[in-house]
Every structure is written in C-alpha cells, then in structure tokens.
C-alpha cells in the first residue's frame, strides 16, 4: 500500500520497433506523477522520464546499449507536489514490467524498396537498410549490421495483369528475379526473422510496380 | 507442440467440390507461409499452392490454377483448401505443410494427410 | 518451373550401408534444397535444410552436400529405420519442386 492518492501503475507493455523502445503504462495521472527505471538482469538501476505525468517514457538510449541484453523495468508512483512522500513502507510504490529483450522481441518495421532494375528477363530489387538507433563506434547501425543473416527479406512478386504471388528470398538487401520479357511486374516485401517464434514478420511494404519513376528499364 | 491437423477429405463425384481444412496448434499461422502438399496414390509429391495467412498472398500449381482456392482463418488459426471442378487426376492425399519462410524455405512440419478420392 | 532430376528412383541395401542419393536441379538455386523421409502413410518429415544442414533430432549419419545444382543426400551407415523413400525439394523460386523420389528397400 502507497500514499493515500497514488495509486501503482499497471499495464506495463513494452512498444519497440527497429530497436525504437517506449515503455507504456496505465493509468492517466491524477494527482500523482512517474518515474521509470530500467537494469539488465545484473545490472544497477537507472532512472528515466523523471516525475512525468506522461504515461510513456522512451528508453531506447538504455536499450540500444546492447540490444541482446534482457531488460526489466519499473515505474514509480508519487504524489503530485509531494515527490519525496513514500508509501506505509517507507518505499514509494512501483509495479515491474515484463522481461524485454530487444534483439528478439523489437518488432520489424515496414521495409522500403528502395529501387528494382530490369536488365532483359533479370529484375534486381533493392530494399532500403533502414538505419536504427543502436551505435557502434558512433555511428548508427543499419538493420542489417545489426540482426546480419538472422534476417532476411521475403519478395512477393506478381505480373500486373495475374493475381498469384511468386516468392522469392534472401539474406542480403537484394534479390535477382526471372521475370517474363514485355510483362510489367509489381513487388511487395516483407521483412523476416526465420528464428524467431513471435514477431517473426514486418508488414508489407508499399507495392512498387514496373513503370513506376523507382524502377530503370533496360533492354539488351 | 507444433501440430497441422488436415480434415475434410472424401469420396466426391468428379466436378464437385470440397473443402479440405489444416488446423494448426503450437504456432501463430500468421507468422508463417502454409503450403498444400498432394500425393497421388503410390506417386511422388507434388505441391499445390501457398497462402502468407498475414496478408493473403497466394500462389498455385498451374494444374490447379483457377479450380483450386486456398484461404486462411487467422482468429482460427486454420488455412483452407477449396477445391472445385475436381477431376480423377486430383485423387491424392493431401497434405499441409509450414514454411518456416528461411532462405532456403524448408517444410518443417506436415500434417498426417487427408485422403481426397475423385470417382464416379 | 526448375526441375529437380533425382536417382536412382529405387536401391537395394543392407544395413550398415553407405547410400548416396542425388538429385540435379534444372537452373541455379542456390542452397535453397531440402531432404524429406518418407515412409508409407505417413507425412513426409525434414532431414535436410539449405542443402547441409541437419534439421532437429535428425541422426548424424544423415548429411546432405552440394556441389553447383548438384546436392546429395547421405546416409553413412544404414539402420532398419531408414528404409523409406527420400525426396529433394527446391525452394528458390515459385513453385517449390520435388524431386520424384528415392525407394530404399533392404537388400
């Protein structure tokens, strides 16, 4: 039990996308504000989002410190104007959030193609590596750099005028497709992480069709 | 435990219609690729189509394009096979299969089978 | 469609054996092979995946290479349980294929 008007926070749920990580709760303040708190399993505590009434607080700077370490945090509760108040035991209340870990849980963001090229029956479709917040040696890590062939990229691949998905995949940025001569093509693709159990699949990205301005077109 | 459970199969006239089921336990469909799978009696396999249950996505054999539909149910976690204008040459059993959607796109984990028989 | 051409379409052995099957795709693809048991009615169950790799609780006496659009199967000493039929599959590109399947049957 805390002080009179605090009440714990609840809720707890871990938001991560492409290691973008926000730790969301509940309820709404009244009278009281927040303070998170987040450690590795070994490690000591931290303290984020300082007496904040928001009900959010975005720890990526904590988690991209190493994305394969397992994360736990807690959001305390205070009273309004009367921060340094605890509860009957001396301690303020706080409720704990599940286990996170990053690198198998952040959810995969939309891919982009980033470009397609025909050269005769060959298409060459690029997806865009999307730049994350993890850093080595200060710079930004690609999505790549960071899950290597852990992730891979499925194509779906249609003639304009058919409606069956052919598929194709890899563990690079690119693929290399055999593609009907005269016949313009559409692509969608879906970015995957074959070992994992949940949060396998990104969504699908914008469909890009051939005779669009991202594709080249060149006849040998 | 991962488990694909066919139903459905049967004795059906040829140009009539059936509804094969695979229910899967064990795992999220959506978060896989479901394939049918046929086996004539005492022929090899032959694969029949593929659904992405998270966004309907699919593609058949040519020998069944146009007759065959598969859909899935993701809040039942079940794929379908609807076949029509079935003909002798699609007696077989039929099997579903997961795609673990790796690189090399293994199959790795079947159902038993369900036994469709085309005969007048 | 690629081809997946596979021989012998049946063999004898004995267990203790060492059985090599092969299977020659049509085109390129890649490392995208697998290897299925199968044994009469029942599902076809995964031995082998990208080519050479031992799929779970797999016996090691089972091995797959590749060499180009060549892959092979192994079986270094066979065991009672392994009589069965073995089929390749290609999936590089749509539609997967198989290869039309290896009988072994005990000498």
């Known amino acids: 039990s805390g002080t009179t008007n605090t009440v714990a926070a609840y809720n707890l749920t871990w938001k991560s996308t492409n290691f973008k990580t926000i730790l969301e709760w509940e309820p709404k303040p009244v009278n009281q504000v927040y303070t998170v708190q987040i450690s590795t399993k070994s490690g000591d505590w931290k303290s984020k989002c300082f007496y904040t009434t928001d009900t959010e607080c975005d720890l990526t700077d904590e988690i991209v410190k190493d994305v394969k370490q397992t994360y736990l945090a807690r959001v305390f509760s205070y009273p309004a104007g009367n921060v340094e108040s605890t509860g009957s035991a001396g301690e303020p209340l706080y409720e704990n959030s599940p286990e996170f870990t990053p690198y198998l849980e952040t959810n995969l963001g939309q891919p982009t193609i980033q470009s397609f090229e025909q050269v005769g029956t060959k298409v060459n479709v690029t997806v865009e590596d999307e730049r994350t917040l993890v850093r080595r040696n200060n710079t930004f890590l690609s999505l790549r750099d960071v899950f290597g062939k852990d992730l891979i990229y499925t194509l779906y691949y249609w003639k304009s005028s058919s409606s069956g998905k052919k598929t194709a995949k890899t563990n690079t940025n690119e693929f290399l497709i055999d593609v009907d001569k005269g016949e313009n093509y559409c692509f969608s693709v879906q970015a995957v992480i074959p070992s994992r159990t949940v949060n396998r699949k990104s969504t699908d990205s914008p469909v890009e069709c051939m005779g669009q301005e991202k594709g080249e077109f060149r006849e040998i | 435990e991962v488990q694909l459970v066919e139903s459905g199969g049967g004795l059906v006239q040829p140009g009539g219609s059936l509804r094969l089921s695979c229910a899967a336990s064990g795992f999220t469909i959506s978060y896989y690729i479901i394939h049918w799978v046929r086996q004539a009696p005492g022929k090899g396999l032959e694969w029949v189509g593929y659904i992405d249950p998270s966004n309907g996505y699919t593609y058949y054999a040519d020998s069944v394009k146009g007759r065959f539909t598969i859909s899935a149910d993701t809040s039942k976690n079940t794929a379908y096979l609807q076949m029509n204008s079935l003909r002798a040459e699609d007696t077989a059993v039929y099997y579903c299969a997961r795609d673990v959607q790796s690189v090399s796109g293994e199959f790795d984990y079947w159902g038993q089978g369900t036994l469709v028989t085309v005969s007048s | 469609d690629i081809q997946m051409t596979q021989s012998p379409s049946s063999l004898s052995a004995s267990v203790g054996d060492r059985v090599t099957i092969t299977c020659r795709a049509s085109?390129?693809?890649?490392?995208?092979v697998a290897w299925y048991q199968q044994k009469p009615g029942k599902a076809p169950k995964l031995l082998i995946y990208?080519?050479?790799f031992l799929y779970s609780g797999v016996p090691s006496r089972f091995s797959g290479s590749r060499s180009g659009t060549d892959f092979t199967l192994t079986i270094s000493s066979l065991q009672p349980e392994d009589f069965a039929t073995y089929y390749c599959?290609?999936?590089?590109?749509?539609?997967?294929?198989f290869g039309q399947g290896t009988k072994v049957e005990i000498k």
């Open positions: 599959q290609q999936h590089y590109t749509t539609p997967p294929t």
């Open positions: 990208s080519a050479s």
């Open positions: 085109q390129d693809v890649n490392t995208a």
